[in-house]
């Protein structure tokens, strides 16, 4: 029986250039967490196994770091990240339970309002 | 080097059981999953059984057309999967092949070079 | 009748490209990471693509791999005689709580 459940950061937002952590957390079980898997729609991010270790895709190895913990840090970010991230929790004995992150990167507010106001 | 040998194949009568085993050298045995896979005379690859590295508590996984008559099992201290087939028919003809699977839900990077089975009266 | 679909044949002349795609469920594709297997003849499967789209070192980069929804492909860019074999689409399946293959396409290069 899954008693545990994902909580993660939910709706977040960062700027166009600047990094983000994704981060979720399984409570409320007693099971082992054997892997963990950052997924975007159809594209592996990377996966965290406990035996193993960490496998970043090669897609996005200068671009994203392992941690803090299990979470994952996506860096130089650009407006195409925006979208859903999946954290997907491999336990025992529980089975899988999968969390959502959706993450909306902005243009720069620098870059949009620096000009007005420059100081003359 | 990654190593893996399969044995105990061989011509057996419908219903007779046989038990295939693969040896495994080469690599940390105990924390990979490992899995069997079978291929009938031209045919495609059937995935047969699976069983979780010891992380996950040696699980065991079946396909629908041999639950509950195959029989998956590991001795991680000598480093060797096995497969219990019993009431064998037919249909179970085929080269048997053992593969490692890395990562949960990962690939099968290492296969062996299989064993045949022929189910035969 | 196999979990997921895959053309029984596919073929191309020397240089061209081939691309075989490989048709699934919500339950197996649409949830999880697709695997290419190419199996030449007369020898055990070898890993070919994994995780949708990584390639094993020494796998030549004309091999490439995507997956969208509950469908994914391979293509070969510039198909050479050497790459005649039966090629598998793979996937783990949350209904079957098991690995699924495709029926497999068997590749003559022309």
């Known amino acids: 029986m899954m008693t545990g459940t994902i909580e993660t950061t939910g709706n977040i937002s960062a700027e166009k250039g600047g990094s983000i952590i994704l981060q979720c957390h399984l409570s409320s079980t007693t099971a082992q967490v054997t892997q963990v898997n950052w997924e975007q729609q159809d594209q592996l991010l990377a996966i965290c196994n406990a035996d193993l270790g960490w496998h970043i895709s090669p897609s996005f190895k200068d671009r994203v770091a392992p941690g803090p913990g299990l979470g994952l840090t996506l860096q130089s970010l650009t407006v195409n990240d925006t979208g859903e991230y999946f954290c997907i929790y491999h336990t025992y004995p529980d089975g899988t339970y999968t969390g959502r992150i959706f993450l909306e990167v902005l243009e720069s507010s620098v870059a949009e309002h620096g000009a007005r106001f420059q100081i003359p | 080097d990654v190593q893996l040998v399969e044995s105990g194949g061989g011509v057996v009568r419908p219903g007779e059981s046989l038990r295939l085993s693969c040896a495994a050298s080469?690599?940390?045995?105990?924390?990979?999953?490992m899995n069997w896979v079978r291929q009938a005379p031209g045919e495609g690859l059937e995935w047969v059984s699976g069983?979780?590295?010891?992380?996950?508590?040696?699980?065991?996984y079946y396909a629908d057309s041999v639950r509950g008559w195959f029989t998956v099992s590991r001795d991680n201290s000598k480093n060797t999967l096995y497969l219990q087939m019993s009431s064998l028919r037919a249909e179970d003809t085929a080269v048997y092949y053992c593969?490692?699977?890395?990562?949960?839900?990962?690939?099968?990077?290492?296969w062996g070079l299989g064993t045949l089975v022929t189910v035969s009266s | 009748q196999s979990v997921l679909t895959q053309p029984p044949s596919a073929s191309g002349t020397p240089g061209q490209r081939v691309t075989i795609s490989c048709s699934g469920s919500?339950?197996?594709?649409?949830?999880?990471?697709v695997y290419w297997y190419q199996q030449l003849p007369g020898t055990a499967p070898k890993l070919l693509i994994y995780?949708?789209?990584e390639r094993p070192s020494g796998v030549p980069d004309r091999f490439s791999g995507s997956k969208s929804g509950t469908s994914a492909s391979l293509a070969i860019s510039g198909v050479q005689s050497e790459d005649e074999a039966d090629y598998y689409c793979?996937?783990?399946?949350?209904?079957?709580?098991?690995?699924?293959f495709g029926g497999g396409t068997k590749l003559t290069v022309l």
């Open positions: 593969a490692r699977e890395t990562w949960i839900r990962g690939y099968f990077d290492y």
């Open positions: 080469g690599f940390n045995f105990s924390t990979y999953a």
């Open positions: 069983i979780s590295g010891r992380s996950s508590g040696d699980t065991t």
């Open positions: 919500r339950s197996n594709l649409g949830n999880n990471l």
């Open positions: 995780f949708n789209n």
């Open positions: 793979a996937t783990w399946d949350d209904s079957l709580n098991g690995w699924v």
